[in-house]
């Protein structure tokens, strides 16, 4: 019996087609992805093959203005339209709190939404009961397939699930649910979840009874053969893991942003054992036409976005200096504003010992593309912020050793004075440079804001200590020459859309007046 698994993950609000780098589509003839194009391909496969499941491994939420405006209603609407069969909860599904998950998505989805390792407690338990499930058995042709869900247990540090959801260890939570499926004589079981490729592989190895793992969170690109676009494969598709009980378990992920549709064909014997598995992600490029009915629906929903772009988010009573002349040479108040917003967006008081889990921000000055003038009645709009942060990136959480941070700050000024983008703006950091010294030895003081303290204060950076830092995904991926971050980071979790972070902060503060306050000094 043959099953076709179509899968997406980390779509992050890319409902419309995008450029090849998943930013805003500029030249339509070269654009990719989007739900209208995805639907065309899915329908084509559904027509051609008998047993097809369309699955999503989480993080539909967060990433573009679509999410900012529609807050998840767009996810439910278009996933229903595409007739997804199941979805696992990702960490970003909790970005607007539990209410922001329940109302727009859980109550509106016409497909099961899954996670076996999230347990509700207190008053939330009855409110959310039945709205998401640990697993679902789906009839496919004349057979049944069990789908069991899981979500990163780091979600409380990455999003806003509140205090009434407990995120358990994935493997511990999955095993009894898979065992339950076995008692129901379900002998074909897919683990669908959002904990990253390393955990996906561990689940394949450790959870008895799981036949296939469909993952997300780490934006992992797997491919067999010559890859069709810029993404470099982390391994073959499917990635085969040998389980502890000796089975070959295929593990798949489909990069991110709806650029690819994962396509995996599995052959099962009559006892539900995987005999063979093969496939590849399908690049959703312009050779695949956009479905006209879905496209028309997208255009209808778009109208509200255009109106939103020009609405006032808040006011500034000072000039927001985002000029290259400032932000690539010295501390600029636009950099301070953005870093403050980045930290504010990551406030998670999860432990009495820590006032917060993260206190530091770094931001490449070259990523700040425009100032905002206060003389336009102080008004700040989404449109203004899109000029400051036009690249559609995310502000991510990483863990780095102090020694890596020191290297990053040396890189920040290694060719100072040439208006290059690597000059770092900061938050929760005090840095002093001496430009008279040779490149690679210019950081003379580097103090960082403590987290394990009741009164935050600045202490010297310790080279061997592991620190959490918020930074643009561009830096996490080694952009602007920050190869040491990419090579040495100990953990990387994708965060929220950059503009969304800043716009939320401005809306919250209502009136802003960021200053230049001595975060970056030259001796």
């Amino acid at each position: 019996w043959e099953l076709t698994i179509l899968h997406t993950n980390d779509v992050h609000s890319r409902l419309e087609q995008t450029s090849e780098d998943s930013s805003k589509c500029v030249n339509a003839s070269r654009c990719m992805g989007g739900v209208a194009r995805l639907f065309t391909k899915v329908q084509q496969i559904r027509r051609a093959e008998p047993n097809v499941l369309l699955l999503d491994a989480g993080d539909q939420y967060q990433g573009t203005i679509w999410f900012t405006v529609y807050k998840g209603a767009e996810v439910a609407h278009f996933m229903n339209a595409l007739r997804y069969d199941a979805m696992a909860l990702g960490n970003h599904e909790f970005d607007n709190g539990v209410e922001g998950l329940i109302e727009p998505l859980l109550k509106e989805a016409k497909f099961p939404i899954l996670s076996a390792n999230i347990k509700a407690k207190g008053p939330l338990a009855s409110q959310i009961s039945g709205l998401y499930l640990p697993y679902k058995v789906l009839p496919v042709g004349d057979e049944v397939v069990g789908i069991v869900g899981y979500t990163s247990k780091e979600t409380p540090f990455l999003s806003n699930p509140g205090t009434n959801l407990v995120f358990e260890d994935e493997i511990t939570a999955l095993q009894p649910e898979v065992d339950k499926l076995k008692t129901l004589n379900v002998n074909k079981i897919i683990a669908l979840g959002h904990s990253g490729f390393e955990m996906d592989k561990l689940i394949a190895q450790k959870v008895r009874g799981v036949d296939v793992v469909v993952g997300g969170h780490s934006n992992t690109f797997l491919y067999t053969g010559n890859p069709p676009s810029k993404e470099v494969p982390a391994g073959k598709y499917p990635f085969i893991v040998t389980s502890d009980d000796g089975r070959k378990v295929p593990v798949v992920q489909a990069y991110a942003f709806g650029k690819y549709l994962g396509y995996l064909k599995i052959e099962f014997d009559e006892r539900g054992n995987v005999i063979s598995s093969h496939g590849n992600p399908i690049l959703l490029n312009s050779s695949i036409p956009e479905d006209p009915s879905i496209k028309a629906d997208i255009n209808k929903w778009r109208i509200k976005l255009d109106n939103y772009s020009t609405q006032e988010l808040g006011k500034t009573i000072v000039y927001l200096d985002g000029s290259s002349q400032s932000c690539r040479f010295r501390e600029c108040n636009m950099g301070n504003l953005i870093c403050d917003a980045m930290i504010n967006n990551n406030l998670r008081h999860t432990d009495e010992m820590f006032w917060n889990h993260v206190s530091m921000c770094i931001l490449n000055g070259g990523g700040i593309r425009s100032p905002i003038d206060e003389r336009n009645n102080g008004t700040i709009t989404w449109e203004n912020l899109a000029a400051v942060l036009p690249f559609g990136g995310t502000f991510d959480l990483v863990q780095l050793k102090g020694s890596t941070l020191k290297k990053a700050f040396e890189h920040s000024v290694h060719r100072y004075g040439q208006s290059t983008g690597e000059f770092l703006q900061v938050g929760g950091i005090h840095v002093v440079y001496d430009l008279s010294r040779k490149p690679g030895d210019r950081v003379v003081k580097l103090d960082v804001l403590c987290t394990k303290c009741r009164v935050p204060s600045y202490d010297p950076l310790k080279m061997d200590e592991v620190y959490k830092v918020i930074l643009p995904n561009f830096l996490a991926n080694g952009g602007d020459g920050f190869q040491m971050i990419k090579d040495e980071l100990l953990r990387h979790d994708s965060g929220d859309q950059d503009i969304n972070v800043v716009s939320t902060y401005i809306s919250k503060m209502k009136v802003i007046y960021p200053a230049v306050e001595g975060r970056i000094k030259f001796s």
Epitope: S126, G130, V137, D142, E143, V144, K180, T183, V186
Partner: antibody, heavy 119, light 107 residues
Framework: QVQLVQSGAEVKKPGASVKVSCKAS????????IHWVRQAPGQGLEWMGA????????SYNQKFKGRVTMTRDTSTSTVYMELSSLRSEDTAVYYC????????????WGQGTLVTVSS | DIQMTQSPSSLSASVGDRVTITCKAS??????LAWYQQKPGKAPKLLLY???SLETGVPSRFSGSGSGTDYTLTISSLQPEDFATYYC?????????FGGGTKVEIK
């Protein structure tokens, strides 16, 4: 609306067999299990087994295995339960009930069929 | 098989009373618990599933709680139509099993 309509009462002699039917309507017949639950006079409820009409897959309570047969006719959306080698202690009301494949609580029940086993 | 032990087996109460019925499983059932109400000569009726989820159309005076092996059905203010027999059922492990029932009678 969802309805499960069962066949009428039966009187059988010990050693005989009885076949009870359950006709489903108001939902997609092939996507839910049909369970059989019995209740002896003045007693509690006892699950006998279930059939998944989509593929004919059957789960039994081991206590009844070998004596109970469950079949389905998708053309008429009907499920049948046959119990053989009847004994007096099989006298009970037999209910069919609908349940999810994966979460077997019973949201809709038939009206019940009284089977009396007496010599 | 998982044994479901219900207590009490019967109770007398008056209209307006708060009534609590307990159900204990012989092993953990991971919140896969349902409650049914049955009146004489009628089929059982689903009240709650997943411990706490109220079936559509069931009055909010019925509520459920518990975890692990111990579960409770509460009727916050007993109404005349609530006099019936109540059963719990586990659906974690085949064979699905019911409690022995609790008959709620008029005092």
């Amino acid at each position: 609306q969802v309805q499960l309509v069962q066949s009428g009462a039966e009187v059988k002699k010990p050693g005989a067999s009885v076949k009870v039917s359950c006709k489903a309507s108001g939902y997609t017949f092939t996507t839910y299990n049909i369970h059989w639950v019995r209740q002896a006079p003045g007693q509690g409820l006892e699950w006998m087994g279930a059939i998944f009409p989509g593929n004919g897959h059957i789960s039994y309570n081991q206590k009844f295995k070998g004596r109970v047969t469950m079949t389905r006719d998708t053309s008429t959306s009907t499920v049948y339960m046959e119990l053989s080698s009847l004994r007096s202690e099989d006298t009970a009301v037999y209910y069919c009930a609908r349940g999810d494949y994966d979460e077997s609580y019973f949201d809709y029940w038939g009206q019940g069929t009284l089977v009396t086993v007496s010599s | 098989d998982i044994q479901m032990t219900q207590s009490p087996s019967s109770l007398s109460a008056s209209v307006g009373d708060r009534v609590t019925i307990t159900c204990k499983a012989s092993e953990g059932i991971y919140n896969r618990l349902a409650w049914y109400q049955q009146k004489p000569g009628k089929a059982p009726k689903l009240l709650l599933y997943g411990v706490i989820s109220l079936e559509t159309g069931v009055p909010s005076r019925f509520s459920g709680s518990g975890s692990g092996t111990d579960y409770t059905l509460t009727i916050s203010s007993l109404q005349p139509e609530d006099f019936a027999t109540y059963y719990c059922q586990q659906y974690w492990s085949i064979p699905w099993t019911f409690g022995g029932g609790t008959k709620v009678e008029i005092k």
